[in-house]
């Protein structure tokens, strides 16, 4: 029932505007005049609705219907005109509030003294507001009763309805603006400082970038003391035995060197960055890889025979007998290093395969991958 809705919205807005304008203790004559004008408009509206009720009996007489409809149209136009006046008045007061907000800064110290008076005034205003709300509720009831009779006239009044809705929408926007001003003023009064929150959690680690170009070979440095034992390289054939070096005192661990070229022998040495855990023998188990100094597992997404083949061959086995999913050899405890690994099957180690991302949060240890290598 559009009439009820429009009147109730207007009533609520009127209440909000009154609160917004009086709730700050700016009891200037201008504001009091605005209240009076507003209440007068509301009173006029009430009288006009009462007039519609009085004319209700005349509706039965079809002879007077058309004349009545035209009169009603005229009355709604009057209401629309009054709403426009009200809108202009509210706009004027919006400008006044802008100026008031500017002067509030300089009045800040004075307002602190007035705070007690404001609280008393607020109490009175709340009483007045409560009374106004009761009156508006009664008015809403009356309007609801009237709206039942007016429903028959809805077709002729569609155009008018749209216009009034538009005006109410504008009024809503103004009210919201006033509410916002009210909030800004209260924030100024409370002197609240907003503190920036802590930074968010770090994003996921980016994909590994492509290998950079090799730089030119540098001049050989002096023979340094031996570093800590590095990771074992990929399967290579042993070269000829070198001459024994001078014994040196142990030094700091040096950076990992580049992978050497294959020698000419035929002995397979396993790639120590991969191990099999939890199987019946060394040829099978949950696949664990050493990365960043920590052993971790591989998620079984896209875990297929070609990947298992690479793992087994890198460990010195001739091939893969089976690949296992869903933590077949038990769940690991370390990080889940890899989610999706893609191999064609002939790569010398799993690191040579296409790895989308190191360190994944998309899997759980219930999806740890395993292999059984052929003996």
């Amino acid at each position: 029932k559009w009439e009820t809705k429009n009147c109730s919205v207007s009533s609520t807005n009127a209440n909000d505007i009154t609160q917004s304008l009086t709730g700050k203790g700016n009891d200037s004559e201008e504001e009091m005049r605005f209240q009076e004008v507003f209440m007068e408009h509301m009173s006029n509206m009430e009288k006009r609705i009462q007039h519609i009720l009085d004319m209700e009996a005349n509706l039965m007489d079809t002879e007077h219907f058309q004349n009545f409809s035209m009169t009603t149209d005229q009355r709604f136009n009057d209401i629309l005109l009054q709403l426009s006046t009200l809108f202009s008045s509210v706009q004027g007061h919006g400008n006044a509030i802008d100026e008031i907000s500017k002067s509030l800064i300089s009045l800040n110290t004075t307002l602190l003294d007035l705070q007690l008076n404001i609280e008393n005034l607020n109490g009175k205003i709340q009483e007045n507001t409560f009374k106004q709300q009761e009156e508006i509720s009664k008015l809403e009831e009356r309007v609801y009763n009237v709206s039942a009779e007016i429903m028959a006239m809805k077709e002729e009044q569609v155009h008018l309805e749209q216009e009034i809705k538009g005006e109410v929408k504008v009024l809503n926007n103004i009210t919201n603006d006033l509410r916002l001003k009210d909030w800004e003023h209260s924030q100024t009064l409370r002197n609240i400082t907003l503190i920036q929150g802590p930074p968010g959690p770090p994003g996921e680690k980016g994909d590994r970038g492509p290998t950079g170009e090799s730089g030119p070979r540098g001049f050989p440095g002096p023979i340094g003391p031996p570093g800590l034992k590095g990771d074992r390289g990929a399967i290579g054939f042993p070269g000829s035995r070198g001459l024994p070096g001078y014994a040196g005192r142990p030094g700091n661990s040096g950076p990992k060197g580049q992978k050497g070229e294959k020698g000419s022998g035929n002995t397979l040495t396993p790639f120590t960055k991969v191990r099999l855990v939890g199987g019946s023998g060394p040829h099978e188990g949950r696949v664990e890889i050493l990365h960043s100094g920590q052993w971790g597992t591989i998620c079984d997404d896209r875990w297929e025979v070609r990947v298992g083949q690479v793992v087994c061959r890198s460990l010195g086995y001739p091939g893969v007998q089976a690949v296992h999913k869903a933590a077949h050899f038990g769940q690991g405890t370390g990080p889940i290093w890899l989610n999706e690994v893609f191999c064609f099957g002939r790569e010398s180690s799993i690191e040579e395969c296409k790895i989308r991302q190191w360190g994944t949060r998309a899997c759980s240890h219930s999806e740890d991958a395993g292999v059984t290598c052929t003996l």
Epitope: E213, S214, R302, E304, Q309, C343, F344, R346, K354
Partner: antibody, heavy 121, light 108 residues
Framework: QVQLVQSGAEVKKPGASVKVSCKVS????????IHWVRQVPGKGLEWMGG????????IFAQEFRDRVTLTEDTSPDTAYMELSSLKSEDAAVYYC??????????????WGQGTLVTVSS | DIQMTQSPSSLSASVGDRVTITCRAS??????LNWYQQKPGKAPKLLIY???SLQSGVPSRFSGSGSGTDFTLTISSLQTEDFATYYC??????????FGQGTRLEIK
Amino acid sequence: QVQLVQSGAEVKKPGASVKVSCKVSGYTLTELSIHWVRQVPGKGLEWMGGFDPEEGETIFAQEFRDRVTLTEDTSPDTAYMELSSLKSEDAAVYYCTTPRYCNNGICYDYWGQGTLVTVSS
Amino acid sequence: DIQMTQSPSSLSASVGDRVTITCRASQSISNYLNWYQQKPGKAPKLLIYTASSLQSGVPSRFSGSGSGTDFTLTISSLQTEDFATYYCQQSYSNFPITFGQGTRLEIK
């Protein structure tokens, strides 16, 4: 050490089909992937299709999508490439090759000896 | 699809010469470029992968460089067995794999 041995030369009529085989040794067929590349005499190399581990399926170059069929027989570890509706432009040497990832990129380090297919009416 | 263009299409040189072949991609392919050598009646042979990594067993006189769209294959001192056709191949887009049209290296 992987080895790829292809079937012998073929002479076909336009509209017919040709089936080239590629026998794998050193690995089983399930342990690696086979791709096919052709070379028209006096021209460059043209990739036809093969298994993509990222997609988990065999994919083809647009030009061959409707005419080429790639199959595998695991008991003799042999891969097959069948090209249908032959045209004179299909006369070429057909190679099977096995890829691997080289620093995340795809490279072909083992090739079959090639099979010459002649299309003549 | 990514187009690969090699230049020159043919080249004459003498034993001992330093030879450079270039390959240009139609869009940036990072360093995902390989070089192959092919001799008449034979299958291609991988020389260099990912722009500059020398394949095992390939003589050190072969070297590769470049990144993005422009790449070069250099033979520092040409030997008799190096006279062949050379192809570049990109694998940036995974599939379709595309090759250059080839550069034929002949004896002067």
